[in-house]
């Protein structure tokens, strides 16, 4: 057989090299970047999605800060360290020795130091704020409709349990998308809410991380949904720790 | 290699209870995906009855929701669904599956005849 | 609920021959929540593609999806003797999921 004909590629992630080597010749995948094993019947991890993005480096995320206590993506992208089960490392340093601590989905959460710097736990992100703006249309959408299809999206496309969908407030042409999931929540198997945004940020900007499954077709009773600016605002289980001067 | 397999009894009596189980081997119960109960009468197509998440939550088809319970052990792995009130008409094979983006393991299906 | 008519009801063609197969669902349906089977007799549906025309693990290439909105297509390109059986469409973009009656492909 080709590789086409056994299709051995992973659904879930296209940033993989994947060969029919697994028990039984079943198809196997390995993240880019990290070799690691991945699961590809859900969402990889963002901090080994990260790791593969390395090797082929886009423009960085931007975001901006809605309130004292929310964290934004501005430092760009950088090479994480993630632990065995790809998760981010508590503590993240490049190559000049330069260290910090940073959340559940990679945000830095504290003044930059130096090896000396102590991160003691990875410190969860359990509310995400996704900030949507739509392109115009002939009208605006119906609320209770647009929440369904958001709801449904987080679900079918993203495995994220309706649950974790905390509200879907619209006053057009801006959409906001509120994800909740709290340590204590979030069951073996549940699909990260910091992961579900990321692969939602990738869609909307017609970076689809998901293999050969075609872009975003969002669609509210049959009207075409176009997204034309995202902002993501991340808020942590414990506050961030930055210093006077960096919020002055 | 994830794999299904459905098992109860063949033969059920009209207005009584229709209990089957399905196992999930190689791979667990508690991931992201929903795990779905399909039927299909004998030479006709393929209707789908319902849904359970590994924290219980369901979703049911409307035409079958009052008389249909599904339910999940995540202990042993295994999902469960009950039809009560059953006639003629709920004879047929009965699948499990897998629902991630799409039906994509299915069990190889059990035949269940409503005959007094 | 949304209801989805395949057709034609069943197609006859020989081995080698291109077969065509159609869906259409009663209200507009987003391609990333249509997928085919494919039904032997005595087997359990097998997943074909998802997402319109993303190919399952193991689906041979001959196989592809199309379509949007209302209107999708199953293609096989070129008929082999193990294409011979029923297929179905399903949509999983709204509860509750719902296939198509099947399409029967069989041997002229």
């Known amino acids: 057989h080709t590789a086409a004909q056994d299709n051995c590629t992973c659904p879930t992630n296209k940033m993989t090299v994947c060969s029919p080597d697994g028990p039984g010749g079943r198809c196997q995948c390995r993240a880019l970047g990290s070799g690691v094993a991945v699961d590809c019947s859900t969402l990889t991890s963002e901090c080994l999605l990260l790791k593969a993005r390395m090797s082929a480096p886009k423009n960085a995320r931007t975001l901006v800060r809605p309130n004292e206590h929310a964290l934004v993506d501005n430092d760009g992208l950088y090479d994480p360290d993630c632990d065995p089960e790809g998760r981010f490392k508590a503590r993240q340093c490049n190559q000049t020795s330069v260290c910090w601590c940073v959340n559940s989905v990679g945000v830095r959460r504290t003044d930059k130091g130096d090896l000396s710097l102590r991160c003691d736990e990875l410190v969860r992100t359990h509310h995400i704020l996704i900030d949507l703006r739509h392109r115009p249309t002939a009208g605006a959408f119906n609320h209770s409709d647009l929440d369904a299809e958001l709801r449904r999206l987080f679900r079918e496309r993203y495995r994220l349990h309706p649950k974790f969908v905390a509200a879907v407030h619209y006053e057009q042409p801006t959409i906001q998308i509120e994800l909740r999931q709290n340590t204590s929540q979030k069951a073996a198997g549940d699909v990260d809410i910091g992961d579900a945004a990321y692969y939602f940020e990738r869609d909307v900007k017609g970076e689809s991380l998901f293999q050969g499954r075609g872009g975003l077709d969002l669609r509210v009773r049959g009207e075409p949904l176009q997204v034309e600016r995202t902002l993501i605002y991340y808020l942590d289980e414990i506050p961030p720790k930055f210093s006077m001067k960096r919020l002055t | 290699q994830v794999q299904l397999q459905e098992s109860g009894p063949g033969l059920v009596k009209p207005s009584g209870t229709l209990s089957l189980t399905c196992a999930v081997s190689g791979g667990s119960i508690s991931s992201s995906n929903w795990w779905s109960w399909v039927r299909q009468p004998p030479g006709k197509g393929l209707e789908w009855i319902g849904e359970?998440?590994?924290?219980?939550?369901?979703d049911y088809n409307p035409s079958l929701k009052s008389r249909v319970i599904i339910s999940v052990d995540k202990s042993k792995n295994q999902f469960s669904l009950k039809v009560r009130s059953v006639t003629a008409a709920d004879t047929a094979v009965y699948y499990c599956?897998?629902?991630?983006?799409?039906?994509?393991?299915w069990g190889q299906g059990t035949l269940v005849t409503v005959s007094s | 609920e949304i209801v989805l008519t395949q057709f034609p009801g069943t197609l006859s063609l020989s081995p080698g021959e291109r077969a065509t197969l159609s869906c259409r669902s009663s209200q507009s349906v987003s391609s990333s929540y249509l997928a085919w089977y494919q039904q032997k007799p005595g087997q359990a549906p097998r997943l074909l593609i998802s997402g319109a025309s993303s190919r399952a693990t193991g689906i041979p290439d001959r196989f592809s999806g199309s379509g949007s909105g209302t209107d999708f297509t199953l293609t096989i390109s070129r008929l082999e003797p193990e294409d011979f059986a029923v297929y179905y469409c399903?949509?999983?973009?709204?509860?509750?999921?719902?296939f198509g009656q099947g399409t029967k492909v069989e041997i002229k």
């Open positions: 399903q949509q999983y973009g709204s509860s509750p999921r719902t």
């Open positions: 599956a897998r629902d991630n983006w799409g039906f994509d393991y």
């Open positions: 359970i998440y590994h924290d219980g939550s369901t």
